[in-house]
């Protein structure tokens, strides 16, 4: 079967999910690719409890999550409903700011230094977090 009892090597288990925390930075799309090649996805935050867990592990560092509005409305990468789901934006965010001078607005969400969320230019090389559910992980632990 596809169920497993524990998380892969280098991943952290929490509430039936496995989390992997990067040590370097990538653009949002590249981070998304990385997680997919781990048969995982960029982290999807569904509760205050999960928010606190991720925040504790990443510290005060800008870090991508699996939330974007590159095609219009805000969407979680795993299909979790954005409108009815947990949110933790900074005040007055998201603002799709165009004043950065990099072209376009801000279409990708990240954890800021205080853990609250901000939308930013997707090309910025931020750290990232991958997540996979325990019952979706394979029998063998993937080695990075």
């Amino acid at each position: 079967g596809s169920e497993r009892a524990c998380c892969p090597v280098n991943w952290v288990e929490h509430e039936r999910s496995c989390y992997w925390f990067s040590r370097s930075g990538k653009a949002w799309a590249d981070a998304d690719n990385y997680c997919r090649l781990e048969d995982a996805h960029l982290v999807v935050v569904t509760s205050w409890e999960e928010q606190k867990f991720v925040q504790h592990h990443i510290g005060p560092v800008n870090t991508w999550m699996g939330l974007h509005d590159q095609n219009g409305p805000w969407k979680w990468v795993d299909g979790t409903d954005y409108e009815t789901g947990f949110k933790n934006w900074r005040p007055e965010q998201p603002d799709d700011w165009y004043g950065h001078g990099l072209g376009g607005g801000e279409d990708c969400a990240h954890f800021t230094d205080d853990g609250r969320w901000n939308d930013d230019v997707c090309q910025r090389p931020y750290r990232w977090v991958c997540e996979t559910e325990l019952d979706k992980a394979s029998q063998e632990p993937p080695l990075l």
Epitope: S24, K26, L37, S138, E140, P142
Partner: antibody, heavy 121, light 107 residues
Amino acid sequence: QVQLVESGGGVVQPGRSLRLSCAASGFTFSSYGMHWVRQTPGKGLEWVAIISYVGKNKYYADSVKGRFTISRDNSKNTLYLQMNSLRAEDTAVYYCARRGNSYGGYGMDVWGQGTTVTVSS
Amino acid sequence: DIQMTQSPSSRSASVGDRVTITCQASQDISNYLNWCQQKPGKALKLLIYDASTLETGVPSRFSGSGSGTDFTFTISSVQPEDIATYYCQQYDNVPITFGQGTRLEIK
């Protein structure tokens, strides 16, 4: 010991198809992502494709996208590369390689000996 | 795509010489760089990963350094068995890309 052995190469006409295989042994195949890489005297080493350890996710070089398909059968410890609509420029030695243990990267740590594909009319 | 510029393309050295090869990435790749060795008719062999970590079983005369865009590979004392072509490879992002190779010959 850890070993990767490619097979399936040969001479094929332009527009035809070929399937390469890579038999893995000496490690838990289902725990590793895998790559195909090719080498030509003119262009050197060129990455072709990568597949995740379960096989759900795949990425390709632009030069082969839509023509080549990477797949794997973890029950047989085998990696495949289905090559369709072959062109003269696909002529190369094809290597399979294991995705290594770098934290956050995609590097290769073990390579096969390679199998030669020649596309010629 | 990230371009990898490797130099020199060939190098002739005497046994015992110190040999240095450089590799430059067209954009920041952190430390996501391998150095591989290819001998004629043999499989490629990983020597250095993460820019500076020696692969298990590889002799300590091989070393690597660098981060970001500029990287160096060194053989501190060349041995006859080191005759080969050496490649750098970035694996920060797909598509993975390689340097053009450096062919090492012994005088």
